[in-house]
């Protein structure tokens, strides 16, 4: 990963010198490549059963896998997760706010992994090797340029990808009504590898 | 902001001691509060005129304002931006890839700012003071709890907010066909402050 933090990129471009500081390609690629990045996640998306309650804050900062891989058959997925427990304010209607503990899954280590069966039927396998391995398909381009593309944000939010071969997440725990730690329905995370979006569980 | 980076949260929760390290409320709040956070942004969303070309990587890491404010009438918006120029590979159909320089806008400083005219007609202004100022509206809760909520991710992606009083962005530059940097039509950014989503330009 690049040595220059993004905070410095912001300031380097307009420093008044005639030679604008250009972030070199390898560094741009490195920062866009598959990794765990801090992301704000809606509490209720992680705890859908709590939809009738309100939390403050209503979103929490978690590390989630995101970024590009070098091939459209590869997707950025978590290969190691860990639980983190946070204290939030819960508002029960008509009652004063009170603290609760909620446990979330964080992505600790990310890798580019194959999603089996992703090869399009109209693209013969022996033809794929000729395509650039760092580009995504775009309909307006000729066949040669529609083979393998490492990363496409556009439209990825709504696309549903097949399950990636990702180790099943550490099951998340949350307080059950009976007081014992209750295992959430394991999210056999049909990871939607957000090719440059966030890898979030499909529900 | 909290001293503990999120990377450490991931590892602290399972340390085997009976006293699990729970991230305290003020720290959780601090990390969810309005700030500039690194985010992967689709190149073509920033350069829509380049939709017929392909870039590698197709997304770049930029600092963008995101997070919660203490009131649903406040939104996390950039109050200072700066340009950053990056080197990417551009693929023109039938041609070999070549480096180009693209300039992007980063959010340097974020603030919670009022979005005028956001008060719902069914919520009288004099009633608002009684409501918790750190909670978002949820239909299932009584009126008292639907007044002011600092942060709601859910649905925010599709909601269109009025323009925030944000300084106009530094116009972005990108290489023109003639090789000289060509000024993009300035994006009088109707900022969509993504209450816990990313503040991204509306187009």
């Amino acid at each position: 990963l690049p040595a220059v933090p993004p905070q410095q990129w912001a300031l380097s471009a307009g420093n008044g010198s005639s030679e604008v500081e250009v972030v070199p390609f390898q560094e741009v690629w490195g920062r866009s490549y598959c990794r765990a990045l801090e992301r704000l996640v809606d509490v209720v998306s992680e705890y859908p059963s709590e939809v009738e309650h309100m939390f403050s804050p209503s979103c929490v900062s978690l590390l989630r896998c995101t970024g590009c891989c070098g091939d459209e058959n590869l997707h950025c997925v978590p290969v190691e997760t860990a639980n983190v427990t946070m204290q939030l304010l819960k508002i029960r209607s008509g009652d004063r706010p009170s603290y609760v503990e909620l446990t979330f899954s964080q992505h600790v280590r990310c890798e580019c992994r194959h999603s089996p069966g992703r090869q399009s039927p109209d693209m013969p396998g022996d033809f794929r090797a000729d395509a650039p391995s760092f580009l995504p398909p775009r309909r307006s381009l000729p066949m040669l340029f529609r083979m393998e593309w490492g990363c496409a944000l556009t439209g990825s939010q709504s696309a549903v990808w097949p399950s990636s071969p990702v180790p099943e997440e550490i099951p998340r725990m949350h307080p059950g009504r009976n007081g014992k730690k209750q295992q959430r329905k394991p999210l056999r995370e049909k990871m939607k590898p957000e090719r440059c979006g966030d890898a979030v569980p499909r529900r | 902001l909290p001293a503990v980076p999120p990377q450490q949260w991931a590892l602290s929760a399972g340390n085997g001691s009976s006293e699990v390290e729970v991230v305290p409320f003020q720290e959780v709040w601090g990390r969810s509060y309005c700030r500039a956070l690194e985010r992967l942004v689709d190149v073509v969303s920033e350069y829509p005129s380049e939709v017929e070309h392909m870039f590698s990587p197709s997304c770049v890491s930029l600092l963008r304002c995101t997070g919660c404010c203490g009131d649903e009438n406040l939104h996390c918006v950039p109050v200072e931006t700066a340009n950053v120029t990056m080197q990417l590979l551009k693929i023109r159909s039938g041609d070999r890839p070549s480096y180009v320089e693209l300039t992007f806008s980063q959010h340097v400083r974020c603030e919670c700012r009022h979005s005028p005219g956001r008060q719902s007609p069914d919520m009288p202004g004099d009633f608002r003071a009684d409501a918790p100022s750190f909670l978002p509206p949820r239909r299932s809760l009584p009126m008292l709890f639907r007044m002011e909520w600092g942060c709601a991710l859910t649905g925010s992606q599709s909601a269109v907010w009025p323009s925030s009083p944000v300084p106009e962005e530094i116009p972005r530059m990108h290489p023109g066909r003639n090789g000289k940097k060509q000024q993009r039509k300035p994006l009088r950014e109707k900022m969509k402050p993504e209450r816990c989503g990313d503040a991204v330009p509306r187009r």
């Epitope: 503990e101 | 203490g70 600092g150």
Partner: antibody, heavy 116, light 112 residues
Framework: QVQLQQSGAELVKPGASVKISCKAS????????INWVKLAPGQGLEWIGW????????KYNEKFKGKATLTIDTSSSTAYMQLSSLTSEDTAVYFC?????????WGQGTLLTVSS | DIVLTQSPDSLAVSLGERVTMNCKSS????????????LAWYQQKPGQSPKLLIY???TRESGVPDRFTGSGSGTDFTLTISSVQAEDVAVYYC????????FGSGTKLEIK
């Protein structure tokens, strides 16, 4: 209605241990923190620690680490505080209290007297 | 650790009088984003358990008479009883919950 019923007064010898109980009723036990507070004669209130029955997680005031141990039994909706290596300094009324960040329901208190 | 200093230690007033007591924190208890101060006031009558009066520095707990008012923000807080009644004889504690919990030393209210 919400109630926290604490065990009765205790007279114990120095060096011994004692376990005070707090039985909760009238609400879902696992949804709210249980805190423990000390009120020593002629002193003010001191927070000892909390336990979150939904997870069993605990947090202690540094001053009471090694002195107090908080546990729960969710099947009986009961919280416990064990105090060890007792000295005269531990003579006090101990309260269990529901909720955080604001303590809304208090037990009636358990008087612990440490004397030889 | 956050230290809360209450003043005065004790005060004696006549029935119907207005009384104020103070609580000063060694650091700000204000969560500026929420615009809430994590401070509460408790009343402990002789031989009883403490009772929550005020939270968020100024929000009155349900059932608490409106003669009790909390004010202040950040580091300086005040509890005011507009017209003291005989049943208000008690020790009043402030408590911070910004970082864990600490109580002030208490202010003892007596009737002259």
């Amino acid at each position: 209605q919400v109630q926290l019923q604490q065990s009765g007064a205790e007279l114990v010898k120095p060096g011994a241990s004692v376990k005070i109980s707090c039985k909760a009723s009238g609400y879902t036990f696992t949804d709210y923190y249980i805190n423990w507070v000390k009120l020593a004669p002629g002193q003010g209130l001191e927070w000892i620690g909390w336990i979150y029955p939904g997870s069993g997680n605990t947090k202690y005031n540094e001053k009471f680490k090694g002195k107090a141990t908080l546990t729960i039994d969710t099947s009986s909706s009961t919280a416990y505080m064990q105090l060890s290596s007792l000295t005269s300094e531990d003579t006090a009324v101990y309260f269990c209290v529901r909720d955080s960040p604001f303590f809304d329901y208090w037990g009636q208190g358990t008087l612990l007297t440490v004397s030889s | 650790d956050i230290v809360l200093t209450q003043s005065p230690d004790s005060l004696a007033v006549s029935l119907g009088e207005r009384v104020t007591m103070n609580c000063k924190s060694s650091q700000s208890l204000l969560n500026s984003g929420m615009r809430k101060s994590f401070l509460a006031w408790y009343q402990q009558k002789p031989g009883q358990s403490p009772k929550l009066l005020i939270y968020w520095a100024s929000t009155r707990e349900s059932g608490v008479p409106d003669r009790f008012t909390g004010s202040g923000s950040g580091t300086d807080f005040t509890l005011t009883i507009s017209s003291v009644q005989a049943e208000d004889v008690a020790v009043y504690y402030c408590k911070q919950s910004y970082h864990l919990f600490t109580f002030g030393s208490g202010t003892k209210l007596e009737i002259k």
